[in-house]
Interface confidence: low
C-alpha cells in the first residue's frame, strides 16, 4: 500500500515537472517572439497602452469591444487557469480589416466612395470561418424603416451595370443612439480571395424613408471609430502532429 502511494507521488511529480518544463519553454518562446517584434519595431520596451487608449483607437463596434474586454479578463486572470497546449489544437483568429482607398472607387465629383479592403495574407479562402461587414447607422429623429444595401463593384458590363448586390435588408430604427449593423459577407470574401482581381470594392447605402443616407462611410466630426470594417474569423489548423 505504502509502495503504491510512493509510486503515485513519483508519477505526479514527473507529470508536474513535464508541465512546468512545457510551460517554461512556451513562456520563453513567447518572450523570444516579443523581443523579435520589438526589434522589428525598433523599440526597446513594449509600449504601455492602456485599455482606454485602445478603446479610443479602435472602431467603437461590438466585436472589438468584446475582444478588448476578453483581453482584459485574460490579463486579470492569474496564471493558475487551465493551460492549453496550442501546438495540438486548431485556433481561430479574428482579423479586423479597415477600408483603404482605391482608384476604382472614385465618384464623378472626385470624392472616393467606401469601401475597398486589402486583405492580409493570413486570410485564405479555405480558412475563413466567418466574415462580417460592420456598418454604423447614424441616429434617426423619428421612427423610420431603413433600407440597407451592400453593392459589390464589378468591371462595367455591356449594359453599363457597374455593381451587383451582396445583401439588402430592411430594419426599423427608433430615435436615440445610432446602431451597428453586421452583414454576412463570407461568400463574397471567399470569392475575392479566390479571384483577387474581382475585388474592386463595395458600396454601402443605408437610406431612410426620405432617402437620407444614414451609413457612416467617411466619419465626420465626432464620428471617430465609426468607420465600416470587416471582422474576419480564420482558422489555423495545426501543422504538427502529436508527438
Amino acid at each position: 500500500n505504502e509502495n503504491s502511494e510512493q509510486k503515485e507521488n513519483v508519477e505526479k511529480e514527473g507529470l508536474c515537472n513535464a508541465c512546468t518544463w512545457r510551460q517554461n519553454t512556451k513562456s520563453s518562446r513567447i518572450e523570444a517572439i516579443k523581443i523579435q517584434i520589438l526589434s522589428k519595431l525598433r523599440l526597446e520596451t513594449a509600449p504601455n497602452i492602456s485599455k482606454d487608449v485602445i478603446r479610443q483607437l479602435l472602431p467603437k463596434a461590438p466585436p472589438l469591444r468584446e475582444l478588448i474586454d476578453q483581453y482584459d479578463v485574460q490579463r486579470d486572470d492569474s496564471s493558475d487557469g487551465s493551460l492549453e497546449d496550442d501546438d495540438y489544437h486548431a485556433t481561430t483568429e479574428t482579423i479586423i480589416t479597415m477600408p483603404t482607398e482605391s482608384d476604382f472607387l472614385m465618384q464623378v465629383d472626385g470624392k472616393p466612395k467606401c469601401c475597398f479592403f486589402k486583405f492580409s495574407s493570413k486570410i485564405q479562402y479555405n480558412k475563413v470561418v466567418k466574415a462580417q461587414l460592420w456598418i454604423y447607422l447614424r441616429p434617426v429623429e423619428t421612427p423610420t424603416t431603413v433600407f440597407v444595401q451592400i453593392l459589390r463593384l464589378i468591371k462595367p458590363m455591356k449594359d453599363g451595370t457597374r455593381y451587383t448586390g451582396i445583401r439588402s435588408l430592411k430594419l426599423d430604427m427608433n430615435p436615440g443612439t445610432g446602431i451597428w449593423q453586421s452583414i454576412d459577407v463570407k461568400t463574397v470574401l471567399q470569392n475575392w480571395l479566390k479571384q483577387p482581381e474581382s475585388n474592386l470594392g463595395i458600396e454601402i447605402k443605408a437610406l431612410d424613408e426620405n432617402g437620407h443616407d444614414l451609413a457612416v462611410t467617411f466619419p465626420g466630426p465626432g464620428e471617430d471609430g465609426l468607420n465600416p470594417f470587416l471582422e474576419v474569423k480564420v482558422t489555423d489548423t495545426p501543422k504538427r502532429s502529436r508527438r
Epitope: 424603416t145 433600407f147 444595401q149 453593392l151 455593381y163 451587383t164 448586390g165 439588402s168 430592411k170 447605402k205 437610406l207 424613408e209 426620405n210 432617402g211
Partner: antibody, heavy 127, light 107 residues
Framework: EVQLVESGGGLVQPGGSLRLSCTAS????????MDWVRQAPGKGLEWVSY????????YYADSVKGRFTISRDNAKNTLYLQMNSLRAEDTAVYYC????????????????????WGQGTLVTVSS | DIQMTQSPSSLSASVGDRVTITCQAS??????LNWYQQKPGKAPKLLIY???NLQRGVPSRFSGSGSGTDFTFTISSLQPEDIATYYC?????????FGGGTKVEIK
C-alpha cells in the same frame, strides 16, 4: 403625412382612352418607385404597372401591355397612367401606390411592397 | 407567372379567437411575401412585409411567418375592427401577383 390622390376616372366606351393622374405629397416623390393596382367590382387586387423613381424603368402586367403607359413628372409630384384601347374587363377602381423603399437602392430582382395607397378612382368601360 | 393560392376564401370567428390564413406560392419566392388588409370601401393597407416584418404602426396581434412557398398570416386575438379582406402578395418577380383574398367576419 403621405397622401396620394387619384383623379381622371369615369365612364368610357370600349376602344376609348383615359388618362389617370395621382398627385403625391408628404414624401420625396422623386425618390420612390410607384405602382398602379386595380380592383374590379367585387373582385381581388390586380397589379397593373410599376415605374422607378427616375421614371427610367417600367413594368406592366401582361393584360395591359401595349395598351397602358405609366409615366411620372417628378417636378409636379404626379404619377400618370395613360390607358388606350380600353376593354370592358378594364373596369375597376384604380389605385396609385407608393413603393416602400427609395429607388436609389437596387433590389436585385425582388420588388418591394407598397406601403401607402390612394383612395382610388373608378374607371367604367361600357357602351 | 407566380400563382398565389390563399385559403380559406372566407372565415367566421369570434372576438378574441386566433385566426390563421395561409398562402402558397407556385414557386419559391424566398421571403418576398406581403400581407394587406382591405376594409369595405377603403384602400388596402400594408400589414406585414417580407413574410414576417410588421409594418410600423400596425398592432402586434398581427404576425406573419414562412419562407419558400408556404406562408401563414395570424391574428392572435381577433378584434371587431379586424373585419376585412386580407390579401397576400408576392414581390419576388414581375408580374407582382396577389392571392384571391380571405374575407374575415365576426360570428
Amino acid at each position: 403625412e403621405v397622401q396620394l390622390v387619384e383623379s381622371g376616372g369615369g365612364l368610357v366606351q370600349p376602344g376609348g382612352s383615359l388618362r389617370l393622374s395621382c398627385t403625391a405629397s408628404g414624401f420625396t416623390f422623386g425618390s420612390y418607385p410607384m405602382d398602379w393596382v386595380r380592383q374590379a367590382p367585387g373582385k381581388g387586387l390586380e397589379w397593373v404597372s410599376y415605374i422607378s423613381g427616375r421614371g427610367d424603368v417600367t413594368y406592366y402586367a401582361d393584360s395591359v401591355k401595349g395598351r397602358f403607359t405609366i409615366s411620372r413628372d417628378n417636378a409636379k409630384n404626379t404619377l400618370y397612367l395613360q390607358m388606350n384601347s380600353l376593354r370592358a374587363e378594364d373596369t375597376a377602381v384604380y389605385y396609385c401606390a407608393k413603393v416602400q423603399s427609395p429607388s436609389e437602392l437596387l433590389w436585385f430582382g425582388e420588388l418591394l411592397p407598397v406601403d401607402y395607397w390612394g383612395q382610388g378612382t373608378l374607371v367604367t368601360v361600357s357602351s | 407567372d407566380i400563382q398565389m393560392t390563399q385559403s380559406p376564401s372566407s372565415l367566421s370567428a369570434s372576438v378574441g379567437d386566433r385566426v390563421t390564413i395561409t398562402c402558397q406560392a407556385s414557386q419559391v419566392i424566398k421571403t418576398w411575401l406581403n400581407w394587406y388588409q382591405q376594409k369595405p370601401g377603403k384602400a388596402p393597407k400594408l400589414l406585414i412585409y417580407d413574410a414576417s416584418n410588421l409594418q410600423r404602426g400596425v398592432p402586434s396581434r398581427f404576425s406573419g411567418s414562412g419562407s419558400g412557398t408556404d406562408f401563414t398570416f395570424t391574428i392572435s386575438s381577433l378584434q371587431p375592427e379586424d373585419i376585412a379582406t386580407y390579401y397576400c402578395q408576392q414581390s419576388a418577380s414581375t408580374p407582382i401577383t396577389f392571392g384571391g383574398g380571405t374575407k374575415v367576419e365576426i360570428k
